[in-house]
Protein backbone atom coordinates (compact mmCIF):
# COMPACT_ATOMS: atom_id res chain seq x y z
CA UNK A 1 0.00 0.00 0.00
CA UNK A 2 3.04 2.48 1.08
CA UNK A 3 5.14 1.16 -2.04
CA UNK A 4 5.78 3.24 -4.91
CA UNK A 5 7.31 1.98 -8.18
CA UNK A 6 9.58 5.00 -9.74
CA UNK A 7 11.51 4.60 -12.90
CA UNK A 8 13.98 6.42 -15.33
CA UNK A 9 16.92 6.62 -17.44
CA UNK A 10 20.32 6.62 -16.97
CA UNK A 11 22.47 9.99 -17.15
CA UNK A 12 19.12 11.27 -16.63
CA UNK A 13 17.70 13.15 -13.29
CA UNK A 14 15.15 11.49 -11.10
CA UNK A 15 13.11 12.28 -8.30
CA UNK A 16 11.53 10.19 -5.90
CA UNK A 17 8.98 11.31 -3.41
CA UNK A 18 8.17 9.39 -0.15
CA UNK A 19 4.87 7.68 -0.43
CA UNK A 20 4.25 8.25 3.30
CA UNK A 21 3.06 11.89 4.06
CA UNK A 22 4.04 13.93 6.69
CA UNK A 23 4.32 17.73 7.91
CA UNK A 24 7.27 19.67 6.58
CA UNK A 25 8.57 19.81 9.91
CA UNK A 26 8.66 16.12 10.12
CA UNK A 27 12.00 14.56 9.37
CA UNK A 28 12.27 12.03 6.77
CA UNK A 29 15.02 9.22 6.90
CA UNK A 30 15.97 7.45 3.63
CA UNK A 31 17.72 3.90 3.51
CA UNK A 32 18.82 1.40 0.38
CA UNK A 33 16.63 -1.41 1.64
CA UNK A 34 18.72 -4.35 0.65
CA UNK A 35 21.92 -2.91 2.78
CA UNK A 36 19.75 -0.56 5.39
CA UNK A 37 22.44 1.64 4.64
CA UNK A 38 21.74 5.61 5.18
CA UNK A 39 21.33 8.13 2.32
CA UNK A 40 23.15 10.84 2.81
CA UNK A 41 22.00 14.61 2.86
CA UNK A 42 25.04 15.95 1.59
CA UNK A 43 23.73 17.29 -1.67
CA UNK A 44 27.71 17.07 -3.56
CA UNK A 45 26.47 13.35 -3.42
CA UNK A 46 25.15 11.73 -6.94
CA UNK A 47 22.14 10.52 -4.64
CA UNK A 48 20.99 12.38 -2.20
CA UNK A 49 18.19 12.55 0.44
CA UNK A 50 16.45 16.12 0.54
CA UNK A 51 13.32 15.41 3.17
CA UNK A 52 10.83 13.73 1.33
CA UNK A 53 12.43 13.69 -2.07
CA UNK A 54 15.16 11.07 -2.90
CA UNK A 55 17.13 12.51 -5.69
CA UNK A 56 19.60 10.53 -8.10
CA UNK A 57 21.85 13.51 -9.89
CA UNK A 58 22.06 12.05 -12.19
CA UNK A 59 20.72 7.97 -12.07
CA UNK A 60 22.24 4.86 -13.03
CA UNK A 61 21.43 1.68 -13.57
CA UNK A 62 23.31 0.10 -10.16
CA UNK A 63 20.82 2.44 -8.34
CA UNK A 64 17.84 -0.16 -8.97
CA UNK A 65 16.32 -1.13 -6.20
CA UNK A 66 14.10 -0.82 -3.23
CA UNK A 67 14.62 2.38 -1.00
CA UNK A 68 13.34 2.80 2.59
CA UNK A 69 11.34 6.17 3.26
CA UNK A 70 10.48 6.63 6.99
CA UNK A 71 8.93 9.75 8.00
CA UNK A 72 9.57 10.88 11.79
CA UNK A 73 7.12 12.85 13.69
CA UNK A 74 7.19 13.21 17.78
CA UNK A 75 4.71 10.64 18.16
CA UNK A 76 5.27 8.25 15.29
CA UNK A 77 7.20 6.66 12.12
CA UNK A 78 5.43 6.15 8.87
CA UNK A 79 7.24 3.83 6.36
CA UNK A 80 6.97 3.79 3.01
CA UNK A 81 8.47 2.02 0.55
CA UNK A 82 10.39 2.95 -3.38
CA UNK A 83 10.57 1.19 -5.66
CA UNK A 84 12.95 2.02 -7.97
CA UNK A 85 14.06 0.95 -11.53
CA UNK A 86 16.62 2.59 -14.25
CA UNK A 87 16.90 1.41 -17.68
CA UNK A 88 19.56 2.03 -19.98
CA UNK A 89 18.38 4.65 -22.73
CA UNK A 90 17.00 3.06 -25.95
CA UNK A 91 18.82 3.47 -29.15
CA UNK A 92 16.28 3.33 -31.05
CA UNK A 93 12.48 5.38 -31.07
CA UNK A 94 9.98 2.94 -29.43
CA UNK A 95 9.80 3.82 -26.07
CA UNK A 96 8.90 0.08 -23.99
CA UNK A 97 5.76 -0.39 -21.83
CA UNK A 98 7.72 0.07 -18.59
CA UNK A 99 9.22 3.48 -19.17
CA UNK A 100 5.40 4.98 -19.80
CA UNK A 101 3.37 6.80 -17.28
CA UNK A 102 -0.30 6.32 -17.25
CA UNK A 103 -1.94 6.86 -20.59
CA UNK A 104 -4.64 10.36 -20.71
CA UNK A 105 -7.40 10.74 -22.91
CA UNK A 106 -8.31 13.81 -25.14
CA UNK A 107 -10.89 15.46 -27.43
CA UNK A 108 -11.92 18.37 -29.12
CA UNK A 109 -12.34 20.40 -26.68
CA UNK A 110 -10.23 19.33 -24.02
CA UNK A 111 -6.57 17.82 -25.06
CA UNK A 112 -4.10 18.85 -22.40
CA UNK A 113 -1.10 16.55 -21.87
CA UNK A 114 0.33 16.99 -18.60
CA UNK A 115 4.23 16.31 -18.63
CA UNK A 116 4.11 13.65 -15.84
CA UNK A 117 6.53 14.03 -12.63
CA UNK A 118 7.51 17.61 -13.58
CA UNK A 119 6.19 19.28 -10.29
CA UNK A 120 8.92 16.90 -8.34
CA UNK A 121 11.70 18.93 -10.60
CA UNK A 122 13.26 22.11 -10.34
CA UNK A 123 12.90 23.56 -13.94
CA UNK A 124 12.31 26.55 -16.25
CA UNK A 125 10.00 26.62 -19.42
CA UNK A 126 9.44 26.00 -22.36
CA UNK A 127 9.19 21.96 -22.09
CA UNK A 128 10.30 20.28 -25.41
CA UNK A 129 7.41 18.03 -27.02
CA UNK A 130 7.82 15.13 -29.34
CA UNK A 131 5.09 13.12 -30.71
CA UNK A 132 6.58 9.08 -31.55
CA UNK A 133 10.33 10.83 -31.55
CA UNK A 134 9.68 13.17 -33.74
CA UNK A 135 9.75 16.98 -32.34
CA UNK A 136 6.34 18.87 -32.51
CA UNK A 137 6.16 21.83 -35.07
CA UNK A 138 3.08 23.51 -36.22
CA UNK A 139 0.48 25.82 -34.62
CA UNK A 140 -1.96 23.29 -33.34
CA UNK A 141 0.59 22.62 -30.61
CA UNK A 142 1.45 24.97 -27.85
CA UNK A 143 3.77 24.58 -24.84
CA UNK A 144 1.98 25.37 -21.99
CA UNK A 145 3.86 25.48 -18.41
CA UNK A 146 3.76 21.96 -17.60
CA UNK A 147 1.02 20.75 -20.33
CA UNK A 148 0.97 20.50 -24.13
CA UNK A 149 -1.91 21.68 -25.49
CA UNK A 150 -3.18 20.61 -29.01
CA UNK A 151 -5.77 22.65 -31.27
CA UNK A 152 -8.39 20.54 -33.16
CA UNK A 153 -7.50 17.13 -31.99
CA UNK A 154 -8.21 14.62 -34.42
CA UNK A 155 -7.82 10.57 -34.35
CA UNK A 156 -4.07 10.88 -35.72
CA UNK A 157 -2.89 12.72 -32.84
CA UNK A 158 -3.17 9.85 -30.69
CA UNK A 159 0.36 8.32 -29.74
CA UNK A 160 3.36 7.90 -27.80
CA UNK A 161 4.11 11.67 -26.23
CA UNK A 162 7.29 12.64 -24.54
CA UNK A 163 8.02 15.95 -22.52
CA UNK A 164 12.00 16.93 -22.34
CA UNK A 165 13.11 19.50 -20.04
CA UNK A 166 15.95 20.32 -17.63
CA UNK A 167 15.98 20.13 -13.85
CA UNK A 168 18.63 22.31 -12.28
CA UNK A 169 20.48 21.72 -9.31
CA UNK A 170 22.71 24.17 -7.47
CA UNK A 171 23.29 25.77 -10.97
CA UNK A 172 24.15 22.08 -12.19
CA UNK A 173 21.73 21.09 -15.55
CA UNK A 174 19.99 17.54 -15.95
CA UNK A 175 17.64 16.33 -18.62
CA UNK A 176 14.79 14.39 -17.82
CA UNK A 177 12.26 12.62 -20.11
CA UNK A 178 8.80 11.39 -19.66
CA UNK A 179 6.81 9.56 -21.83
CA UNK A 180 2.80 9.22 -22.12
CA UNK A 181 0.30 7.80 -24.46
CA UNK A 182 -2.39 9.79 -25.54
CA UNK A 183 -5.80 8.55 -26.19
CA UNK A 184 -8.78 10.81 -28.77
CA UNK A 185 -12.07 10.43 -27.68
CA UNK A 186 -15.09 11.02 -30.12
CA UNK A 187 -17.40 13.60 -28.27
CA UNK A 188 -20.96 13.45 -29.21
CA UNK A 189 -19.61 12.78 -33.02
CA UNK A 190 -20.85 10.25 -35.15
CA UNK A 191 -20.62 8.00 -38.38
CA UNK A 192 -21.88 8.05 -41.57
CA UNK A 193 -21.66 6.87 -44.99
CA UNK A 194 -18.98 8.53 -47.02
CA UNK A 195 -20.19 11.51 -48.88
CA UNK A 196 -17.84 12.50 -51.95
CA UNK A 197 -18.21 16.60 -52.20
CA UNK A 198 -16.07 16.49 -55.18
CA UNK A 199 -16.16 15.37 -58.09
CA UNK A 200 -19.65 15.02 -59.01
CA UNK A 201 -20.43 11.68 -60.03
CA UNK A 202 -19.32 11.04 -64.03
CA UNK A 203 -17.44 14.81 -64.03
CA UNK A 204 -15.81 15.51 -67.10
CA UNK A 205 -12.91 17.43 -66.47
CA UNK A 206 -11.14 20.03 -68.98
CA UNK A 207 -7.61 19.52 -69.62
CA UNK A 208 -4.60 21.18 -71.61
CA UNK A 209 -2.01 18.80 -73.15
CA UNK A 210 1.45 19.30 -71.82
CA UNK A 211 0.18 21.17 -68.94
CA UNK A 212 -0.13 19.40 -65.40
CA UNK A 213 -3.98 19.01 -64.02
CA UNK A 214 -4.79 18.30 -60.49
CA UNK A 215 -8.14 16.50 -59.12
CA UNK A 216 -8.85 16.68 -56.06
CA UNK A 217 -10.92 13.54 -54.14
CA UNK A 218 -12.97 15.32 -51.16
CA UNK A 219 -15.44 13.53 -49.10
CA UNK A 220 -16.85 13.41 -45.36
CA UNK A 221 -17.43 10.88 -43.31
CA UNK A 222 -19.48 12.17 -40.26
CA UNK A 223 -18.78 14.29 -37.43
CA UNK A 224 -15.70 14.00 -34.50
CA UNK A 225 -13.12 12.34 -34.81
CA UNK A 226 -13.42 9.28 -37.48
CA UNK A 227 -11.74 6.16 -36.62
CA UNK A 228 -11.18 4.74 -40.00
CA UNK A 229 -11.76 7.55 -43.29
CA UNK A 230 -9.57 7.64 -45.88
CA UNK A 231 -9.50 8.90 -49.70
CA UNK A 232 -7.97 7.76 -52.64
CA UNK A 233 -7.45 7.33 -56.51
CA UNK A 234 -7.60 4.70 -58.87
CA UNK A 235 -6.62 4.83 -62.43
CA UNK A 236 -8.84 1.81 -64.53
CA UNK A 237 -9.64 0.33 -61.24
CA UNK A 238 -6.03 -0.39 -60.52
CA UNK A 239 -4.12 0.91 -57.72
CA UNK A 240 -1.93 4.43 -58.40
CA UNK A 241 1.20 2.76 -57.10
CA UNK A 242 0.17 -0.44 -59.43
CA UNK A 243 -0.72 1.31 -62.81
CA UNK A 244 3.31 2.53 -63.11
CA UNK A 245 2.47 5.77 -64.61
CA UNK A 246 5.34 8.02 -62.87
CA UNK A 247 3.57 10.99 -64.03
CA UNK A 248 0.79 10.56 -62.59
CA UNK A 249 0.76 10.73 -58.35
CA UNK A 250 -1.36 10.83 -55.81
CA UNK A 251 -0.78 13.10 -52.99
CA UNK A 252 1.21 11.69 -50.17
CA UNK A 253 -0.62 12.44 -46.91
CA UNK A 254 -4.33 13.21 -46.68
CA UNK A 255 -5.54 16.69 -45.77
CA UNK A 256 -7.90 16.63 -42.61
CA UNK A 257 -10.54 19.46 -42.49
CA UNK A 258 -13.64 20.58 -40.40
CA UNK A 259 -16.51 21.97 -42.42
CA UNK A 260 -19.34 22.63 -40.60
CA UNK A 261 -18.85 20.31 -38.04
CA UNK A 262 -17.78 17.78 -40.12
CA UNK A 263 -14.76 15.92 -40.43
CA UNK A 264 -13.55 15.64 -44.04
CA UNK A 265 -10.53 14.32 -46.10
CA UNK A 266 -9.04 15.24 -49.27
CA UNK A 267 -6.40 13.68 -51.80
CA UNK A 268 -5.17 15.17 -54.97
CA UNK A 269 -3.90 13.01 -57.40
CA UNK A 270 -0.91 15.10 -59.50
CA UNK A 271 -1.07 14.77 -63.63
CA UNK A 272 2.24 15.93 -65.33
CA UNK A 273 2.26 16.72 -68.68
CA UNK A 274 -0.78 15.86 -70.14
CA UNK A 275 -1.19 13.27 -72.95
CA UNK A 276 -3.55 12.15 -75.21
CA UNK A 277 -3.55 8.67 -73.38
CA UNK A 278 -4.48 10.14 -70.07
CA UNK A 279 -7.85 11.25 -71.94
CA UNK A 280 -8.65 7.77 -72.34
CA UNK A 281 -8.32 6.55 -68.49
CA UNK A 282 -11.14 6.09 -66.21
CA UNK A 283 -9.74 8.27 -62.68
CA UNK A 284 -11.91 7.19 -59.39
CA UNK A 285 -12.27 9.04 -56.23
CA UNK A 286 -12.72 6.92 -53.31
CA UNK A 287 -13.75 7.36 -49.93
CA UNK A 288 -13.79 4.48 -47.44
CA UNK A 289 -15.07 4.81 -43.90
CA UNK A 290 -16.58 1.60 -41.25
CA UNK A 291 -19.79 1.87 -43.39
CA UNK A 292 -17.91 1.03 -46.68
CA UNK A 293 -17.14 2.69 -49.90
CA UNK A 294 -18.17 4.95 -52.31
CA UNK A 295 -16.83 5.86 -55.98
CA UNK A 296 -16.96 8.83 -57.93
CA UNK A 297 -15.48 8.87 -61.48
CA UNK A 298 -13.60 11.45 -63.51
CA UNK A 299 -12.91 11.51 -67.12
CA UNK A 300 -10.77 13.72 -68.57
CA UNK A 301 -11.36 15.62 -71.91
CA UNK A 302 -9.46 18.12 -73.90
CA UNK A 303 -9.85 22.02 -73.61
CA UNK A 304 -10.17 23.58 -76.71
CA UNK A 305 -7.34 26.41 -76.96
CA UNK A 306 -8.89 29.94 -77.52
CA UNK A 307 -8.42 30.85 -80.92
CA UNK A 308 -7.12 34.21 -80.60
CA UNK A 309 -7.85 34.81 -84.38
CA UNK A 310 -11.80 34.69 -83.83
CA UNK B 1 -19.00 -9.35 -54.47
CA UNK B 2 -15.74 -11.35 -52.27
CA UNK B 3 -16.28 -14.41 -50.00
CA UNK B 4 -13.47 -14.38 -46.90
CA UNK B 5 -12.53 -17.86 -45.14
CA UNK B 6 -10.68 -16.82 -41.92
CA UNK B 7 -8.39 -19.33 -40.17
CA UNK B 8 -5.63 -19.45 -37.15
CA UNK B 9 -7.89 -19.26 -33.92
CA UNK B 10 -7.69 -21.50 -31.10
CA UNK B 11 -6.78 -21.36 -27.38
CA UNK B 12 -3.36 -19.63 -25.97
CA UNK B 13 -2.34 -18.57 -23.23
CA UNK B 14 -1.52 -15.32 -21.86
CA UNK B 15 1.45 -13.58 -23.50
CA UNK B 16 1.13 -16.01 -26.57
CA UNK B 17 0.53 -15.47 -30.13
CA UNK B 18 -1.73 -16.56 -33.22
CA UNK B 19 -1.43 -15.32 -36.69
CA UNK B 20 -4.92 -15.52 -38.27
CA UNK B 21 -5.48 -15.49 -41.89
CA UNK B 22 -7.88 -14.40 -44.08
CA UNK B 23 -8.18 -16.02 -47.96
CA UNK B 24 -10.23 -13.71 -50.20
CA UNK B 25 -11.74 -15.26 -53.44
CA UNK B 26 -14.57 -13.71 -55.29
CA UNK B 27 -14.07 -10.36 -56.96
CA UNK B 28 -10.74 -9.85 -55.31
CA UNK B 29 -9.11 -7.37 -57.76
CA UNK B 30 -11.60 -4.87 -56.39
CA UNK B 31 -10.39 -4.85 -53.17
CA UNK B 32 -9.63 -1.73 -51.48
CA UNK B 33 -9.18 -2.99 -47.81
CA UNK B 34 -9.22 -5.20 -46.04
CA UNK B 35 -9.57 -5.66 -42.10
CA UNK B 36 -9.77 -7.55 -38.88
CA UNK B 37 -12.85 -6.80 -36.54
CA UNK B 38 -13.75 -8.31 -33.15
CA UNK B 39 -16.69 -8.81 -30.95
CA UNK B 40 -16.53 -9.99 -27.61
CA UNK B 41 -19.59 -11.72 -25.75
CA UNK B 42 -22.22 -9.15 -25.42
CA UNK B 43 -19.93 -6.31 -26.77
CA UNK B 44 -20.07 -4.70 -30.17
CA UNK B 45 -18.40 -5.36 -32.83
CA UNK B 46 -15.10 -3.45 -32.77
CA UNK B 47 -12.30 -2.50 -35.69
CA UNK B 48 -9.36 -4.21 -34.66
CA UNK B 49 -6.69 -2.85 -37.64
CA UNK B 50 -7.46 -2.52 -41.39
CA UNK B 51 -5.27 -2.35 -44.40
CA UNK B 52 -5.89 0.16 -46.99
CA UNK B 53 -4.81 0.49 -50.31
CA UNK B 54 -1.71 -2.98 -49.06
CA UNK B 55 0.06 -0.19 -47.59
CA UNK B 56 -1.53 2.07 -45.48
CA UNK B 57 -2.38 0.55 -41.93
CA UNK B 58 -4.55 1.30 -38.70
CA UNK B 59 -4.85 -0.13 -35.28
CA UNK B 60 -7.25 0.00 -32.69
CA UNK B 61 -5.51 1.66 -29.49
CA UNK B 62 -5.80 -1.63 -27.74
CA UNK B 63 -3.80 -3.24 -30.00
CA UNK B 64 -0.94 -0.67 -31.25
CA UNK B 65 1.99 -2.64 -30.54
CA UNK B 66 0.92 -5.77 -30.40
CA UNK B 67 -0.99 -6.69 -33.80
CA UNK B 68 0.33 -6.38 -37.32
CA UNK B 69 -1.78 -6.60 -40.39
CA UNK B 70 -0.56 -7.43 -43.48
CA UNK B 71 -1.48 -8.82 -46.65
CA UNK B 72 -0.20 -10.65 -49.69
CA UNK B 73 -1.88 -9.80 -52.28
CA UNK B 74 -0.70 -12.36 -54.98
CA UNK B 75 -2.29 -14.85 -52.74
CA UNK B 76 -5.47 -12.88 -52.20
CA UNK B 77 -4.75 -13.34 -48.52
CA UNK B 78 -4.84 -10.89 -45.70
CA UNK B 79 -2.97 -12.18 -42.24
CA UNK B 80 -3.14 -10.51 -38.21
CA UNK B 81 -0.28 -11.53 -36.24
CA UNK B 82 -1.38 -11.11 -32.78
CA UNK B 83 1.44 -11.06 -29.81
CA UNK B 84 1.51 -10.43 -26.67
CA UNK B 85 -2.47 -11.96 -26.25
CA UNK B 86 -4.46 -10.71 -23.28
CA UNK B 87 -7.77 -12.57 -21.59
CA UNK B 88 -9.55 -9.10 -22.93
CA UNK B 89 -8.31 -10.06 -27.00
CA UNK B 90 -10.62 -13.25 -26.33
CA UNK B 91 -13.83 -12.68 -28.78
CA UNK B 92 -14.23 -14.27 -32.41
CA UNK B 93 -12.10 -12.10 -35.27
CA UNK B 94 -14.21 -11.63 -38.18
CA UNK B 95 -12.19 -10.83 -41.15
CA UNK B 96 -14.21 -8.09 -43.60
CA UNK B 97 -13.13 -6.41 -47.18
CA UNK B 98 -14.56 -3.34 -49.15
CA UNK B 99 -14.05 -2.82 -53.20
CA UNK B 100 -17.08 -3.04 -55.52
CA UNK B 101 -16.72 -3.12 -59.10
CA UNK B 102 -15.52 0.51 -60.66
CA UNK B 103 -18.99 0.77 -61.93
CA UNK B 104 -20.52 0.52 -58.40
CA UNK B 105 -20.43 3.66 -56.60
CA UNK B 106 -21.48 2.60 -53.22
CA UNK B 107 -20.23 -0.76 -51.52
CA UNK B 108 -20.60 -2.08 -47.79
CA UNK B 109 -17.82 -4.33 -46.24
CA UNK B 110 -18.24 -7.62 -47.27
CA UNK B 111 -18.24 -10.63 -43.96
CA UNK B 112 -16.28 -13.64 -43.22
CA UNK B 113 -17.90 -16.20 -40.77
CA UNK B 114 -15.30 -15.68 -38.04
CA UNK B 115 -12.48 -17.55 -35.73
CA UNK B 116 -12.79 -17.80 -32.14
CA UNK B 117 -9.57 -16.80 -30.19
CA UNK B 118 -9.83 -17.71 -26.47
CA UNK B 119 -6.92 -16.21 -24.31
CA UNK B 120 -6.74 -17.89 -21.14
CA UNK B 121 -4.48 -20.50 -18.43
Known amino acids: KFSKQSWGLENEALIVRCPRQGKPSYTVDWYYSQTNKSIPTQERNRVFASGQLLKFLPAAVADSGIYTCIVRSPTFNRTGYANVTIYKKQSDCNVPDYLMYSTVSGSEKNSKIYCPTIDLYNWTAPLEWFKNCQALQGSRYRAHKSFLVIDNVMTEDAGDYTCKFIHNENGANYSVTATRSFTVKDEQGFSLFPVIGAPAQNEIKEVEIGKNANLTCSACFGKGTQFLAAVLWQLNGTKITDFGEPRIQQEEGQNQSFSNGLACLDMVLRIADVKEEDLLLQYDCLALNLHGLRRHTVRLSRKNPIDHHS | EVQLVESGGGLVQPGGSLRLSCAAS????????MGWFRQAPGKERELVAV???????KYADSVKGRFTISADNSKNTAYLQMNSLKPEDTAVYYC???????????????WGQGTLVTVSS
Open chain 2, 96 to 110: AAVGGATTVTASEWD
Open chain 2, 26 to 33: GRTPSIIA
Open chain 2, 51 to 57: IIDSRTT
